[in-house]
């Protein structure tokens, strides 16, 4: 996270922890996770932890370890024979169910889905808070998680920035609607390690509540502008992949 | 298995330029971060610098600034290490290095090259 | 820069007996309560080999024989009981400023 401070887990309790590649995500559920489809495409088996502020290996230790049984990386997610060169991030998105059912507690809890009425529609400037341990201003690589605020911008924003490392042509970038644009302010941004982590938006039905409007997806570079999985067009293909694959009693 | 492959033994000429490499297999490189190690013979680590592969973001150790230039393919998995005006100073073992999931230490290294500076 | 100081530069150790390293920074590695402190072994003709994490952690495959402490600025290796293989240069570093930095090295050599 760049531009962001020092959070708690006990505030953004639905963060999770990937390891390799080093990433976040998000508890939707006792038995689910939710995360981009470009961190789990080349890690099937992916090692999770939740319920820690710090990632210190020592920390991890003594926190909540998650084990997946299976990884659903949404079909429209182009899977490429080289995905370093990835110019099209659309449908970046992936549901992991759990072996075992989380315990729930303070510091480890799921954040809602959008609802699919005009309500979670983002406009322009609606706030959204991320969280992870990525790359900040000072160091690669996070110990203690980091949170920012960003306002939702238009995608045109983003389009607007040079990519920092292009690996094509500028023009082949894909920009589609189930992308969500924000940052912009104060250089507070997502970076390279942030991936999968939810853009929470405040539920507009319940001020105590939060929903993962986005998931941290890629950028055309840290401290600008960074593009999120719009998560309310996946309503319908995360419900359905949950239902297809939940055993009897969670039903 | 993650590995690190550098490149073979250099011998060059006082005052030429020389470019190293570390190919990666078992992960990607734009998922971690590249860093570089000087060994001069019989004597101890330095460390030159780090590069991440993703937007080629860089640090050096001062040092190394105006000696050193890292770089970072994506697409053939692979880092180099390009160092100039070389001298008898550049005599050494380079090594690669990357954090793999840990935060801030090395659990891999690559094998390391020897760059040998002489007229 | 930070500064590793290592003590002794060279260190001779019955089969069996307690060898310890010492690693003194010259300012604080320490970040939000960990030690940003490394151990490595290193035997001729091999790249450094990864033994102790943020001072105390021990990397897996490495025996517990092997064990480190300290923080802040001061840090110990030890190593009991050693062994024939523990034959090697020792070395910390540091990974909590840049430009990270590496002590100048211990020879461990086994009587």
């Known amino acids: 996270i760049i531009g962001g401070s020092d959070a708690d887990i006990k505030n953004f309790p639905w963060q999770v922890f990937f390891d390799n590649p080093w990433a976040g995500g998000a508890l939707i559920n006792e038995y689910w996770v939710l995360t981009a489809a470009h961190v789990v495409e080349g890690n099937r088996e992916p090692t999770m932890y939740v319920g820690s502020t710090s990632v210190q290996t020592s920390r991890l230790a003594k926190s909540k370890m998650l084990t997946p049984e299976h990884v659903f990386i949404h079909p429209g997610w182009k899977l490429l024979e080289v995905p370093e060169g990835r110019t099209n991030f659309d449908n970046d998105i992936a549901l992991v169910r759990l072996k075992d059912p989380v315990k729930m507690g303070p510091t480890v809890s799921p954040i809602c889905l959008p609802g699919t009425s005009s309500d979670y529609n983002l406009m322009d400037g609606d706030l959204g808070l991320i969280s992870g341990w990525g790359r900040t201003e000072k160091r690669d690589r996070a110990v203690r998680l980091k949170a920012a605020r960003l306002p939702v911008a238009p995608l045109r924003k983003c389009k607007e920035v040079k990519v920092e490392k292009p690996t094509a042509d500028a023009e082949a970038y894909v920009f589609t609607p189930n992308m969500i644009c924000a940052g912009g302010e104060k250089g507070m941004d997502s970076c390279k390690g942030d991936s999968g982590g939810a853009f929470a938006v405040q539920d507009p039905n319940d001020k105590t509540k939060f929903y993962a409007a986005g998931l941290v997806s890629w950028g055309p570079q840290c401290g600008t502008y960074g593009l999120y999985t719009r998560v309310k067009n996946y309503v319908d293909w995360i419900m359905k992949t949950m239902q297809e694959n939940s055993t009897p009693r969670e039903d | 298995e993650v590995q690190l492959q550098q490149s073979g033994a250099e011998l060059v000429r006082p005052g030429a330029s020389v470019k190293l490499s570390c190919t990666a297999s078992?992960?990607?490189?734009?998922?971690?971060?590249i860093h570089w190690v000087k060994q001069r013979p019989e004597q101890g680590l330095e460390w030159i610098g780090r590069?991440?592969?993703?937007?080629?973001?860089?640090k050096y150790a001062p040092k190394f600034q105006d000696k050193a230039t890292m770089t970072a393919d994506t697409s053939s998995n692979t880092a180099c290490l390009q160092l100039n005006s070389l001298t008898s100073e550049d005599t050494a073992v380079y090594y690669c290095?990357?954090?793999?999931?840990?935060?801030?230490?090395?659990?891999?290294w690559g094998q390391g090259t020897l760059v040998s500076v002489s007229a | 820069d930070i500064v590793l100081t290592q003590t002794p530069d060279y260190l001779a150790v019955s089969l069996g007996q307690r060898a310890t390293i010492s690693c003194k920074a010259s300012q604080s590695v320490d970040y939000d309560g960990d030690s940003y402190m490394n151990w490595y072994q290193q035997k001729p003709g091999q790249p450094p080999k990864l033994l102790i994490y943020?001072?105390?952690n021990l990397e897996s495959g490495i025996p517990a024989r092997f064990s480190g402490s300290g923080s802040g600025t001061d840090f110990t290796l030890n190593i009991h009981p050693v062994e024939e293989e523990d034959a090697a240069t020792y070395y910390c570093q540091q990974s909590n400023e840049d430009p990270w930095t590496f002590g100048g090295g211990t020879k461990l050599e086994i009587k």
């Open positions: 590069i991440d592969p993703a937007d080629d973001h860089t």
């Open positions: 078992g992960f990607n490189i734009k998922d971690d971060y």
């Open positions: 943020a001072a105390s």
């Open positions: 290095a990357i954090y793999g999931s840990g935060w801030a230490w090395f659990p891999y």
